[in-house]
Interface confidence: low
């Protein structure tokens, strides 16, 4: 399984997730990034197997964002880890 | 099956812009990124820079900051590639590449066939 | 920019051989790392990635290995289709960056 996910840096229009996870255990990583108490459809994401931390651009500001991760192979996906962030104001 | 398929070959004179293109079939566009390498005539092979069409920003590499735009068109699911004040040393084959994934540099899985650039006077 | 120093820069070998390429980082990359196959007038093709995992269709006479600094393609036994250029590739930190290649030659 994932180890943990961490928002690293946060700014007004971007932020930076970090993840751990086992080496070479898996083939991508799916991240969902949703507007947190909206109806908006979430945007989907896959990240190469080798990465542990990627730049989330094109956000918004002041806006409460729920981050999704999930691990893949190409039969298997992890339970998914989540974490809550609020971008900064402009 | 993911395809890329790139424009055709240029012949542009010195201090000119070349604009390549790569179409995307087979896949979802917009949620994985498209990078630019090029390699120059018996070289080797040097990342350019890469754009996330769901965002539409895009990233470049220090060497060719201020000289070459990347874009996409999430309608035709095509990425662009913008070469501008061009000079002898950009002759070369340019490659679009699809990352398997959401990142602008990564481990390129799929590749165009390649736009040959000439640049002569 | 992170390094890749490749070796070495060419090598001549026999079908049958086991051949072993290497690929130095300047600075550590985890397992941040893959290997591209690259014959003339054509795009690269992806073997490896994330250091030792097998593309998908490729045979299993390539294999990876290495963490941090330290990488290695090796072919186990050379066959007449491996003649071609040899990239690793560092995509651990942006920008990504190759070696400057391995071309493997026929004895």
């Known amino acids: 399984n994932l180890g943990e996910v961490v928002v690293a840096e946060v700014g007004w229009d971007a932020l930076k997730l970090n993840w751990t996870a086992p080496e070479g255990a898996y083939e991508y990583f799916f991240i969902q990034v949703q507007e947190a108490d909206t109806v908006e459809a979430a945007q989907n994401l896959t990240v190469p197997g080798g990465l542990r931390s990627t730049d989330l651009p094109g956000l918004k500001a002041a806006t409460h964002y729920t981050i999704t991760i999930r691990g893949v192979t190409q039969d298997f996906s992890t339970t998914p880890l989540s974490v809550e962030v609020l971008t900064e104001e402009v | 099956q993911v395809q890329l398929v790139q424009s055709g070959a240029e012949v542009k004179k010195p201090g000119s812009s070349v604009k390549v293109s790569c179409k995307a079939s087979g896949g979802t566009f917009s949620s994985y990124a498209i990078s630019w390498v090029r390699q120059a005539p018996g070289q080797g092979l040097e990342w350019m820079g890469g754009i996330i069409p769901i965002f539409g920003t895009a990233n470049y590499a220090q060497k060719f900051q201020g000289r070459v735009t990347i874009t996409a068109d999430k309608s035709t699911s095509t990425a662009y590639m913008e070469l501008s004040s061009l000079r002898s040393e950009d002759t070369a084959v340019y490659y679009c590449?699809?990352?398997?994934?959401?990142?602008?540099?990564?481990?390129?899985?799929?590749w165009g066939q390649g736009t040959t650039v000439t640049v002569s006077s | 920019d992170i390094q890749m120093t490749q070796s070495p820069s060419s090598l001549s070998a026999s079908v049958g051989d086991r051949v072993t390429i290497t690929c130095r980082a300047s600075?550590?990359?985890?397992?941040?790392l893959g290997w591209y196959q690259q014959k003339p007038g054509k795009a690269p093709k992806r073997l490896i990635y994330?250091?030792?995992s097998l593309q998908s269709g490729v045979p299993s006479r390539f294999s990876g290995s290495g963490s941090g600094t330290e990488f290695t393609l090796t072919i186990s036994s050379l066959q007449p289709e491996d003649f071609a250029t040899y990239y690793c590739?560092?995509?651990?930190?942006?920008?990504?960056?190759f070696g400057q290649g391995t071309k493997v030659e026929i004895k």
């Open positions: 590739l560092q995509n651990g930190l942006q920008p990504a960056t």
């Open positions: 600075q550590g990359i985890r397992n941040d």
């Open positions: 590449a699809r990352l398997y994934g959401y990142a602008y540099y990564g481990a390129f899985d799929y």
């Open positions: 994330a250091a030792s």
